[in-house]
């Protein structure tokens, strides 16, 4: 239950709602309470936005909302004697933010950011139509663990797309990831619209290769041992393994259901290690194997990410042909 | 050989707290998530969360999140699944198996019946 | 939420006959994820294949699994008596609802 006696007529509205940004996209809602509320009533704030979407019935008088500020955005908010979710809410009150002033064809499309290694941050984007090829593009970004809204550095270019990238190394505070940047890209006259993404860092996380230490035949297997790359821990990876033999000219992938170190032939308690034994290989042909990782989906919920292949490594010897 | 041994049977009422178990050998434990399935009489499977020993991570489906706390010991190579108010809607199969990163089951325990009725 | 469904819900079938069963996903899903489990009555449910393809060891060879995107088959190439069962597919955090193969 939600507090006092809930009187049958409906409260008056709120009063003074206001609503502004902080940091890139962070926007924030305040009010006061109703004038003229019952004096028994116990009062609780309902809320939604625009579409009714994100229902909130809560004591406080505030609301915030991590959006893109690339459409606006309305909240409505009613105030009401209880936390009875059937009762009828006061008046709704509406506030809207709109997306900064300026012309949608300037705006940028396709901002997109990849987490690599989960030491540095690469944004991309395209040039929206209506712009001039001279446009001094700036890109700005924040993150939780971050005091002030930055900068970034140095923008390039690469064939139709312009990026930048940022260095964003995972602490060990575990709440890291569970909070996303904000990123803002605007050009440097002010000529262009604002283009604004939330980039969840559970998502868009691309692993470095790994790196193969040891390869060796053991009883017709093939055993693969490999580095995994640094900052993630084994329960938050997977991988592919190719095998791709001289002789018979084939060309294998593994996915690696089990990469753990447990044979003898292995060397043992090497910090972040993974092993594949791989079945029926001639150890009297040449067999060159490469590896790549993706993050695990129970880690991180985009998972579409493969790392680059590592460098090949090979064993055995190439037949001379008779 | 890997190998997942669960708890036995229980029987309880409405409202009662319960933990149940799995245990692990053959493998290295704390290197492999553990996960719970539920199948209620009848029914499908229900991927209910999973745990990683070696840190204690935890992750759970939104249908079972906050309904089931799941925890492990991996000083006794143990996985457990718990409920700290039962309701007969509870009543099933509840199955511990062994879920490798590629996120399929690999190996599964026996399986522990709860039955919960007034 | 990914949705998986399974057809039919029941295929009867004779043994040594071909045995096809169809998962689809509400969205596209990289097959490294998507499983499939046989389960009989009274017993636990047993992995056949992972990563979509890969069979899990000690799986017969008449087992195989295909299919990428949303469009995922188990084929059972020639029934056995002991094939006679529910067979359920997964990814991740979803199962499918099961497919039953009976004796027809």
């Known amino acids: 239950g939600g507090g006092g006696a809930a009187p049958t007529e409906t409260q008056p509205p709120v009063t003074n709602l206001s609503v502004s940004v902080e940091n890139l996209c962070t926007v924030i809602w305040t009010w006061n309470p109703p004038e003229g509320a019952s004096p028994n009533c116990s009062l609780w704030y309902f809320s939604h936005f625009g579409d009714k979407q994100d229902k909130k019935l809560a004591p406080e008088t505030r609301r915030s909302k991590e959006v893109p500020l690339n459409e606006k955005i309305c909240l409505q908010v009613g105030s009401q004697c209880s936390t009875n979710e059937s009762e009828k809410p006061s008046i709704l009150v509406e506030k809207c933010i709109s997306p900064p002033e300026g012309d949608p064809e300037s705006a940028v499309t396709e901002l997109q950011c990849i987490w690599h290694n989960l030491s540095y941050m690469q944004c991309s984007w395209l040039p929206g139509r209506n712009t001039s090829p001279d446009t001094n593009y700036t890109l700005y970004y924040w993150h939780r663990s971050l005091e002030k809204i930055r900068q970034c550095e140095e923008i390039y270019k690469e064939g139709q797309y312009f990026g930048c990238s940022f260095d964003l190394t995972k602490v060990k505070d575990s709440s890291f990831e569970q909070h996303s940047v904000q990123i803002m890209v605007k050009d440097y006259a002010g000529k262009i619209k604002p283009s604004f993404n939330i980039v969840p860092l559970t998502s868009r996380v691309k692993p470095d290769p790994p790196h193969i230490k040891n390869l060796s035949f053991h009883n017709g297997d093939l055993h693969v041992q490999w580095e995994n790359p640094q900052n993630f821990i084994s329960r938050c990876l997977f991988y592919e393994v190719e095998v791709n033999n001289s002789q018979t000219e084939t060309h294998n992938v593994f996915s690696v259901q089990e990469a753990k170190c447990q044979n003898p032939e292995f060397e043992r308690n090497v910090e972040n290690t993974s092993c594949f034994m791989v079945p029926g290989v001639l150890p009297d042909t040449l067999n060159t194997v490469r590896i790549r990782v993706k993050t695990n989906k129970l880690c991180y919920e985009d998972d579409k990410l493969w790392s680059n292949w590592s460098q090949e490594m090979s064993i055995g010897k190439k037949r001379n042909s008779t | 050989e890997v190998q997942l041994v669960q708890s036995g049977a229980e029987v309880k009422k409405p409202g009662e707290s319960l933990k149940i178990s799995c245990k692990g050998s053959g493998y290295s434990f704390t290197s492999y998530w553990i996960g719970w399935v539920r199948q209620m009489p009848g029914k499908g499977l229900e991927w209910m969360g999973v745990i990683y020993p070696g840190d204690s991570y935890t992750r759970y489906s939104p249908s079972f999140q906050g309904q089931v706390t799941i925890s492990a010991d991996k000083s006794i190579s143990t996985a457990y699944l718990q409920w700290s108010s039962l309701k007969a809607s509870d009543t099933a199969m509840y199955y511990c198996?062994?879920?490798?990163?590629?996120?399929?089951?690999?190996?599964w325990g026996q399986g522990t019946l709860v039955t919960v009725s007034s | 939420e990914i949705v998986l469904t399974q057809s039919p819900g029941t295929l009867s079938l004779s043994p040594g006959e071909r045995a096809t069963l169809s998962c689809r996903a509400s969205?596209?899903?990289?097959?490294?994820?998507l499983a499939w489990y046989q389960q009989k009555p009274g017993q636990a449910p047993r992995l056949l294949i992972y990563?979509?393809?890969s069979r899990a060891t000690g799986i017969p060879d008449r087992f195989s699994g295909s299919g990428s995107g949303t469009d995922f088959t188990l084929t059972i190439s020639r029934l056995e008596p002991e094939d006679f069962a529910v067979y359920y597919c997964q990814q991740y955090e979803t199962f499918g609802q099961g497919t039953k193969v009976e004796i027809k």
């Open positions: 198996a062994r879920f490798p990163n590629w996120g399929s089951f690999d190996y």
């Open positions: 990563g979509a393809s």
């Open positions: 969205q596209s899903i990289s097959s490294s994820y």
